[in-house]
Interface confidence: medium
């Protein structure tokens, strides 16, 4: 299925999920790593505050499920969560899902290759017990714990390459782009908002490409 197939509005939109606002807008008090989205965000200040906490109430997800996650690693997971909760520029990759906790998800968001590489480099000595974090946890305590038989090993054991981490971690929410940061063709997890949000241009590019593809398909069906 093509990404974004379920929506006609691809630009400046919020996903229909657990904590997202219905429409993006300014949020002056976004916390710490989520602050780059202040001018236009799908997250509230309280969501941004909460997601910086270990085992936050947002999802009861414990980053430290195999001992303390290195701070250099954890910052990437916080940034990933900020992008997920706050970005209004992921419309081209929204897909409908039938899940109890959300109606939509992202699929194959083209993450800039350096952002993925750096995430992997900063995390490969931290520890985990699973290669897909959407599925298979023991939730009996209310917080994710390693399932029986899942051994705590270094990230590199479960995510041997940058692609295995970025693409496998959240069931293909991301794919690693061939493009580099600043190209206007890939989504940056990290950016300096003083220069504006570079992901706006990326969303415009892919939304336009999707409209062209959709038009070609309509044209093709009309004539055949």
């Amino acid at each position: 299925a093509d990404p974004g197939q379920d929506r006609t509005d691809l630009l400046n939109v919020c996903m229909d999920a657990k904590h997202h606002k219905t429409k993006p807008g300014p949020e002056d008090k976004l916390h710490d790593q989520c602050s780059p989205w202040k001018k236009n965000a799908c997250c509230t200040a309280s969501t941004s505050q909460e997601l910086h906490k270990d085992t936050s109430r947002l999802y009861n997800f414990n980053w430290d499920h195999c001992g303390k996650m290195e701070p250099a690693c954890k910052r990437h997971f916080i940034q990933d969560t900020c992008l997920y909760e706050c970005s209004p520029n992921l419309g081209p990759w929204i897909q409908q899902v039938n899940q109890s906790w959300r109606k939509e998800r992202f699929l194959d968001v083209p993450l800039c290759k350096e952002d993925c590489q750096r995430w992997w480099e900063d995390c490969h000595t931290s520890h985990t017990c699973k290669s897909n974090w959407h599925r298979g946890w023991d939730w009996t305590s209310g917080v994710n714990k390693c399932p029986a038989g899942a051994l705590c090993r270094t990230f590199e054991s479960y995510f041997p390459t940058p692609a295995a981490l970025c693409e496998g971690l959240w069931s293909h929410s991301y794919k690693v782009s061939n493009y580099s940061r600043g190209s206007g063709r890939c989504i940056q997890m990290w950016f300096d908002s003083a220069q504006g949000n570079p992901n706006e241009e990326v969303a415009r590019f892919y939304a336009a490409a999707m409209h062209v593809n959709a038009g070609e398909m309509l044209h093709h069906h009309h004539h055949h």
Partner: antibody, heavy 118, light 109 residues
């Protein structure tokens, strides 16, 4: 456009070795793992092992441990699979496949037929 | 055990719906991927992760999973869907991959 192009068919004698190459293009070679999978005539797919194209780390199926060696040349964006001590049961089509996350093989080479015959 | 079990053969009438299953312990904590292979050709990924279609794969293909069983469903099977279908999964206990034995799908009519 992502492409994996493999070397041509080989005929080998029992006891010999074979080295198959897989040239990747259209993506950043070092960010993905490359796996090798084989298929004997009329048989199922059989996973052999993989290499982390970034740092060269390898993992092999127990069945092939000691007989298979997977290497890569990052400057040529090419992965190699060498199988030694060949026997007739090794007659198969050998595929390289790019891994997006542990067994999601989104691109495959065209396959290389290796025939082991005396 | 790290085995993945598939029915060797399944048939479906043209235009009808068919489900191909894959069973194994590794599927309790890992998603299956599904491949279509036609004679003399390399396999083609048709479903990956939870229920994701690679571009170019028709949306009559879908995937699902429950417990230790993953399923590939083809809704409105076409003659072009006649092929062998393989599941694979990462093995929970190590950094290895295992394939199912394959299912030969015949489209009747």
């Amino acid at each position: 456009e992502v492409q994996l192009v493999q070397s041509g068919a080989e005929v080998k004698k029992p006891g010999a070795s074979v080295k198959v190459s897989c040239k990747a293009s259209g993506y950043t070679f070092t960010i993905y793992a490359m796996h090798w999978v084989r298929q004997a005539p009329g048989q199922r797919l059989e996973w052999m092992g993989w290499i982390n194209a970034g740092n060269g780390n390898t993992k092999y199926s127990q069945k092939f441990q000691g007989r298979v060696t997977i290497t890569r040349d990052t400057s040529a964006s090419t992965a190699y699979m060498e199988l030694s001590s060949l026997r007739s049961e090794d007659t198969a089509v050998y595929y390289c496949a790019r891994d997006i996350s542990y067994g999601s093989f989104d691109y495959w080479g065209q396959g290389t037929l290796v025939t082991v015959s005396s | 055990s790290s085995e993945l079990t598939q029915d060797p053969a399944v048939s479906v009438a043209l235009g009808q719906t068919v489900r191909i299953t894959c069973q194994g312990d590794s599927l309790r904590s890992n998603y299956a991927n599904w491949y279509q292979q036609k004679p003399g050709q390399a396999p083609v990924l048709v479903i990956y992760g939870q229920n994701n279609l690679p571009s170019g794969i028709p949306d009559r293909f879908s995937g699902s999973s429950s417990g230790n069983t993953a399923s590939l469903t083809i809704t409105g099977a076409q003659a072009a869907d006649e092929a062998d279908y393989y599941c694979d999964s990462r093995v929970s206990t190590g950094i290895h991959v295992v394939f199912g034995g394959g299912t030969k799908l015949t489209v009747l009519g």
